[in-house]
Interface confidence: low
């Protein structure tokens, strides 16, 4: 359905709210080291463009596509040269070369400072001066530190915000009602755009194929009462919007979504039993609601899956006839009777049948070559099954903050070419599996942990990829999609690398350390156990946990002491030395 | 990098015949459906052709039919489509395109396209 002016079409499907909000976003998240003032006036002159639209679809402009008025106005940044460089670049090319640029210098770790939270009172004295400017505010810091945060669902979590704050300033305690719903928002919100980022990077370096493949696992295992067909409906509609999103195209994006939250609210006698409560609920809510639906019960008389994919004399036709349709039909089959399995392990079942299916219908005798293809499943099957079970049995026995150091000893050991601060946030969140899924029952472990594993892995490729510096990872990333947590799992130590020479700064401690919070303090000792590993590589555990010991006694010791930094300056060169001991 | 080369485009005269060739490389051409589209001078883009992966599923627009013939072979990682009875209509930029689609119900998926070859039918 074409319309005279796009932008008008957009400015009246979504509201001026949302509109506003989403065009806000946009900017954010292509000029990232933008002022706030500067985006809200870029963002109200489109604005009050799309209302001369809405007034008059065939007025001057209104005709252009959404990426020509939006980088046409992104290219009238005065300072864009002197603040992004080459990006400037960009402004040079003709669309849709243009915003390809633009995507392509979406930054994943912009050179911003860390939020800092304000007293309660300050916070609700600017919500209560100024709502909206407080809000625009949220979205803009928000996206322009997460270039891939699901739009839409950015609206979302505002919306929450403006709620705590609405609720929380006219309460008797602020901080003991707000802080907690503040946090909340926070971890939710990164959760959220690491999922994102994992999705844009299966569309943009795999294809929408790969996308579109995990999309029918993954709502295979959510709605498995739903038909074949029904899925495909919806993965179509899914990849479409998510496309959108992680090409920038935000005011598409959001309008599909509602659709997509439409249509299956109509049509939920034909998908799940579970969508009833979240179609009640306003648009926002509703669709953030619906992705996170839990799965469905699966339908009791499920035939055996054999009967179609190894029994059957027609495999090989089925195949042949429709390649694609027959192992989506498979991946499917299989996902709605396995809600127990990760969905990349799904996906790696479906790839291994696929290569089963070309070798054997090549062959002599078919159905004799492929009449075993479930049994080589059960290795495949087995190898996250053991991992989550021998992970989760180490968390149990550390605890966290334990937990994550074996991690980071074990990642550190694998790349120690990665930069420390990378090894430090990517194992301190592989850390965080154990909190988020032991202790759920053994049949959601599984999609849980490895499912998060490669949300967490994405992370650590996308940083990677800005700076290349070791050729492991850069494997393990662009190889395979599905195969990238087992390939980082298989991963030993680096034989070839060259341990890094000893630097007695990285282990000079002051007094400040005492002052910081305790997850600040984790960091710390975590960077230097980082530098322990990536000095002496080869060090054993038993080494390293001397070391780990000896530096907490000596900071506790020290913070303890009347005069702080005195100690540290005269205690600190001993730890370091006794640790260079302890690892020689 | 996914390279898709359109060639066997000319000038020829109504009535006669021309055999368009696809050379596709960068990718596994046996795992894609692939398509003919074309642009007629001052015109969209027209949907010409389609054919699955191995050739079993083969379809064609309505104003080419019995005309236009699509194949493949995917040991040569090769795309053609032979055009029978020409008519100035047929005057056009033709493009081959790969399809990404996952399920071959439902639309296709149009993700790489080659440069064009062009075909002019005229006396």
């Known amino acids: 359905d074409t319309h005279k002016s796009e932008v008008a079409h957009r400015f009246k499907d979504l509201g001026e709210e949302h509109f506003k909000g989403l065009v806000l976003v946009a900017f954010s998240q292509y000029l990232q080291q933008c002022p706030f003032e500067e985006h809200v006036k870029l963002v109200n002159e489109v604005t009050e463009f799309a209302k001369t639209c809405v007034a008059d679809e065939s007025a001057e402009n209104c005709d252009k596509s959404l990426h020509t008025l939006f980088g046409d106005k992104l290219c009238t940044v005065a300072t864009l040269r002197e603040t992004y460089g080459e990006m400037a670049d960009c402004c040079a090319k003709q669309e849709p070369e243009r915003n390809e640029c633009f995507l392509q210098h979406k930054d994943d770790n912009p050179n911003l400072p860390p939020l800092v939270r304000p007293e309660v009172d300050v916070m609700c004295t600017a919500f209560h001066d100024n709502e909206a400017t407080f809000l625009k505010k949220y979205l803009y810091e928000v996206a322009r530190r997460h270039p891939y945060f699901y739009a839409p669902e950015l609206l979302f979590f505002a919306a929450r915000y403006k709620a705590a704050f609405a609720e929380c300033c006219q309460a008797a305690d602020k901080a003991a009602c707000l802080l907690p719903k503040l946090d909340e928002l926070r971890d939710e919100g990164k959760a959220s755009s690491a999922k994102q980022r994992l999705k844009c990077a299966s569309l943009q370096k795999f294809g929408d194929r790969a996308f579109k493949a995990w999309a029918v696992a993954r709502l295979s295992q959510k709605f498995p009462k739903a038909e074949f067909a029904e899925v495909s409906k919806l993965v179509t509609d899914l990849t479409k919007v998510h496309t959108e999103c992680c090409h920038g195209d935000l005011l598409e994006c959001a309008d599909d979504r509602a659709d997509l939250a439409k249509y299956m609210c109509e049509n939920q006698d034909s998908i799940s039993s579970k969508l009833k409560e979240c179609c009640d609920k306003p648009l926002l809510e509703k669709s953030h609601c619906l992705a996170e639906v839990e799965n469905d019960e699966m339908p009791a008389d499920l035939p055996s899956l054999a009967a179609d994919y190894v029994e059957s004399k027609d495999v090989c036709k089925n195949y042949a006839e429709a390649k694609d349709v027959f192992l989506g039909m498979f991946l499917y089959e299989y996902a709605r009777r396995h809600p127990d399995y990760s969905v990349m392990l799904l996906l790696r079942l479906a790839k291994a049948y696929e290569a089963t299916l070309e070798k054997c219908c090549a062959a002599a005798d078919p159905h004799e070559c492929y009449a075993k293809v479930f049994d080589e499943f059960q290795p495949l099957v087995e190898e996250p099954q053991n991992l989550v079970k021998q992970n989760c049995e180490l968390f149990e026995q550390l605890g966290e903050y334990k937990f994550q150091n074996a991690l980071l000893v074990r990642y550190t050991k694998k790349v120690p070419q990665v930069s420390t601060p990378t090894l430090v946030e990517v194992s301190r969140n592989l850390g965080k599996v154990g909190a988020k899924c032991c202790k759920l029952p053994e049949a959601k472990r599984m999609p849980c942990a490895e499912d998060y594993l490669s949300v967490v892995l994405n992370r650590l490729c996308v940083l990677h990829e800005k700076t290349p510096v070791s050729e492991k990872v850069t494997k393990c990333c662009t190889e395979s999609l599905v195969n990238r947590r087992p390939c980082f799992s298989a991963l030993e130590l680096d034989e070839a690398y060259v341990p890094k020479a000893f630097n007695a700064e990285t282990f000079t401690f002051h007094a400040d350390m005492c002052t910081l919070s305790e997850k600040e303090k984790q960091v710390k000792k975590q960077t230097a156990l980082v530098e322990l590993v990536k000095h002496k590589p080869k060090a054993t555990k038993e080494q390293l946990k001397g070391v780990m010991d000896n530096f907490a006694a000596f900071v506790e010791k020290c913070c303890k002491a009347d005069d702080k930094e005195a100690c540290f300056a005269e205690e600190g060169p001993k730890f370091v030395a006794a640790s260079q001991a302890a690892l020689a | 990098e996914v390279q898709l080369v359109e060639s066997g485009g000319g000038l020829v005269q109504p009535g006669r015949s021309l055999r368009l060739s696809c050379a596709a490389s960068?990718?596994?051409?046996?795992?894609?459906?692939m398509h003919w589209v074309r642009q007629a001078p001052g015109k969209g883009l027209e949907w010409v052709s389609g054919i699955s992966w191995n050739g079993n599923k083969i379809t064609y627009a309505d104003s080419v039919k019995g005309r236009f013939t699509i194949s493949r072979d995917n040991a040569k990682n090769s795309l053609y489509l032979q055009m029978n009875s020409l008519r100035a209509e047929d005057t056009a930029l033709y493009y081959c395109v790969r399809d990404s689609s996952l399920f071959i119900v439902g639309a296709p998926t149009f993700d790489h396209w080659g440069q064009g070859t062009l075909v002019t039918v005229s006396s």
């Open positions: 960068g990718f596994t051409f046996h795992h894609y459906a």
